[in-house]
Interface confidence: low
């Protein structure tokens, strides 16, 4: 579905009836069992009581049964997405049934009346799933619910009322409007099956949130921290209304969970890790990328089942298209000494020097301060996997980018006008590949020079003792 | 840039019909509903109903369902109102509004159509 | 239906001053939308979503409320500012506007 924003409203308890004056088809709930990967086929359509397509269709008891749930539709057919979605689930678990839920009648309508709709849907699902289990061999333990946007409520709404529990519901980006907060029986929520996994990916603080932005899951991972998606184009997305450019922009992050899932199933050899952490601004700082105790897991498909005592934030970086795998580090710089660093922050720059191959220049990003005489962290990220880490250049860059800065130097200039030059004194830099989970430490190349200053760089190799600490467990890939 | 053109005024007698044509451009037409909006004069805004251009679906106000009609023209990115049985009480500016269907809101509207009438 | 009802009618104020608008809900809505019209010209949109500034809407314009009563205000009245404005919900179809309340120059 594209977006979950259309008039509004509140989950209320009470159904709303489709209004009489609508002309739209009759409000329905179908079962689609695909029984190939090309669109165009009809598949077959399922209903409780009839037992005949079943055998007709070769559903399979014993596999794994997939429903594909739909969202909010502006079009009233089913979008691109879908259709890779259920091509990878079948690429991916061959003899696996792949249903699609279409419940288009019902999602084809103002924001607010497709959501009063997600109950009644909801309950169809669950009134399927209670038929089918009383089929030999079926079991709900093999079900995994993937609902996108509105669907991923309609399958939090179908876990919580079939007899029983589903195995797994796979929510991608939650739809916001009219969810954020509400009550657990109104939303998709934990206890809607066995393992409830999550991608937010249209976040936002600010103004109206398209995806919901509290966790709903046992695990919620938060892409790019959640809010802007790489290769989605503007950032102001209120300010490009104006421009007819909302609709792809929202369209593009709201769908990138969806994707994100598909390459998890195509891709599954270059499987994306996620690393538990508080929030987005910790994990910008590069503190939160342990894999001990859980701390980490894969997203999408192979993600591992966690059903933890509460909600789990998880966060990652990725690349702007599939495959959308990057490889993170947190890199431990500590300060010793700095010298006239006026009001100022330094930006940094890192290139990576690795086995494989070099990383571009990577930004440090200072999400606070530089701290003197601490250990200031960093998250960098590179595309391709540089494989062991041979040596690292750091550069301070030299002249200001923004007038801002410009100004602040000016300033800084103005009271100090005899500043002899702003110096930073680093000995060492510590990397923890997130992936790998191994631990370096890099000294200066010149143990004797350890300064560096605007438009200078450093450089670094692996120190003699290495500092191969206890290795952590490495986030490996269990595959479902 | 988005623009919604409306057709020009019209004077009906009572009894007759009208119908009023709002031509999209600057979109793609069939990715957001089209609404149709009345004031007569001196007075508030009406909701008449909507017409969603991808199929056709509509959805009218209960007040004009036995007398309106909407329908659209793909080839031509235009949607259609049409109401029947006029009566005085119908001379009123009608707008057609795209409603930002990623957004929740009435986000362009027509220049307006006068419809006056008048035996 | 759902019936808004908007006061005062008329809002006498001169440049620089507050302005403070107000839309009753017959029955409970989620949002609110505030639209400006000018003498023959459609109506523009203000506010979206109770509170959230349309683009191009400068901040001297601010959206309040929940339930049944909703305010729309604007901080210092500007020349530019003197025309009517509704209040709209989309919460329950038919989705009806306000009556209207008229800002003139004092």
């Known amino acids: 579905s594209p977006v979950p924003f259309g008039p509004e409203g509140r989950l209320e308890d009470k159904l709303h009836k489709p209004k009489a004056t609508q002309t739209e088809v009759k409000p329905s709930v179908r079962f689609n069992l695909r029984t190939s990967k090309d669109p165009e086929h009809e598949g077959c359509y399922l209903s409780v009581g009839h037992s005949q397509p079943l055998e007709d269709c070769s559903f399979n008891m014993t596999a794994k049964t997939f429903f594909i749930i739909h969202g909010w539709t502006m079009s009233g057919i089913f979008e691109n997405w879908l259709h890779k979605l259920v091509s990878a689930l079948h690429t991916r678990e061959k003899d696996a049934n792949v249903v699609v839920v279409d419940w288009l009648p019902l999602a084809h309508q103002l924001y607010t009346d497709a959501v009063n709709n997600t109950r009644v849907v909801g309950h169809s699902i669950a009134r399927m799933l209670d038929w089918l289990q009383e089929k030999d061999d079926f079991s709900l333990g093999n079900v995994h619910l993937i609902g996108y946007s509105l669907g991923a409520h309609v399958a939090g709404y179908a876990g919580n009322f079939v007899k029983g529990t589903v195995g797994r519901i796979t929510g991608l980006d939650p739809a916001g409007p009219m969810f954020e907060g509400a009550d657990i029986h109104k939303r998709l929520s934990p206890d809607d099956a066995d393992f409830v996994d999550v991608l937010h990916t249209y976040t936002r603080s600010f103004g109206l949130s398209i995806g919901i932005q509290m966790p709903v899951g046992h695990i919620d991972i938060y892409p790019n921290g959640g809010d802007f998606q790489p290769g989605c184009g503007l950032n102001d997305v209120l300010g490009s209304i104006a421009y007819g450019t909302i609709t792809e922009v929202v369209k593009c992050e709201h769908e990138r969970a969806v994707h994100l899932f598909v390459d998890s199933l195509v891709n599954q050899d270059k499987p994306s890790f996620a690393f538990q952490c508080t929030d987005s601004n910790r994990f910008k700082k590069g503190i939160c990328l342990s894999c001990r105790k859980n701390r980490c897991n894969s997203i999408g498909y192979n993600a591992k089942k966690m059903r933890n005592k509460r909600n789990s934030k998880m966060y990652l970086k990725t690349r702007a298209g599939m495959p959308f795998r990057v490889y993170h580090y947190q890199m431990k710089i500590h300060v010793f000494s700095y010298k006239n660093m006026g009001e100022i922050e330094p930006t940094f720059y890192v290139t990576l020097y690795g086995t494989n191959a070099d990383s571009q220049t990577l930004p440090l990003e200072i999400v606070e301060r530089i701290e003197q005489n601490a250990t200031n962290t960093f998250l960098v990220y590179t595309e391709e996997d540089l494989g062991d880490l041979l040596k690292i250049q750091l550069t301070w860059e030299g002249a200001s980018q923004s007038w801002y800065n410009l100004w602040k130097e000016f300033r800084s200039y103005l009271s100090q006008p005899r500043n002899p030059g702003r110096e930073l004194n680093i000995r060492r830099i510590r990397v923890k590949s997130g992936e790998t989970q191994r631990k370096l430490t890099f000294c200066t190349e010149d143990p004797e020079n350890t300064s560096i200053s605007p438009g200078r760089e450093l450089w670094f190799r692996k120190c003699r003792d290495g500092w191969r600490m206890k290795n952590e467990t490495s986030p490996t890939v269990e595959l479902p | 840039q988005v623009q919604l053109v409306q057709s020009g005024a019209e004077v009906k007698k009572p009894g007759a019909s009208v119908k009023v044509s709002c031509k999209a451009s600057g979109y793609t037409f069939t990715e957001y509903t089209m609404h149709w909006v009345r004031q007569a004069p001196g007075q508030g805004l009406e909701w008449m109903g909507s017409i969603n251009p991808y199929y056709g679906g509509t959805s009218y106000n209960e007040k004009f369902k036995d007398r309106v009609t909407m329908t659209r023209d793909t080839s031509t990115s235009t949607v259609y109102m049409e109401l029947s049985s006029l009566r005085s009480e119908d001379t009123a500016v009608y707008y057609c509004a795209r409603y930002g269907n990623y957004v929740g809101y009435f986000d362009y509207w027509g220049q307006g159509t006068t419809v006056t009438v008048s035996s | 239906e759902i019936v808004l009802t908007q006061s005062p009618g008329t809002l006498s104020l001169s440049p620089g001053e507050r302005a403070t608008l107000s839309c009753r809900a017959s029955s409970s809505v989620h949002y609110m939308y505030w639209y400006q019209q000018k003498p023959g010209q459609a109506p523009r949109l203000l506010i979206y979503?109770?509170?959230n500034l349309a683009p191009g809407i400068p901040d001297r314009f601010s959206g309040s409320g929940s339930g049944t009563d909703f305010t729309l205000t604007i901080s210092r009245l500007e020349p530019e500012d003197f025309a009517v404005y509704y209040c709209?919900?989309?919460?329950?179809?038919?989705?009806?506007f306000g009556g209207g309340t008229k800002v003139e120059i004092k």
């Open positions: 709209q919900q989309f919460t329950s179809s038919p989705y009806t």
């Open positions: 979503y109770t509170s």
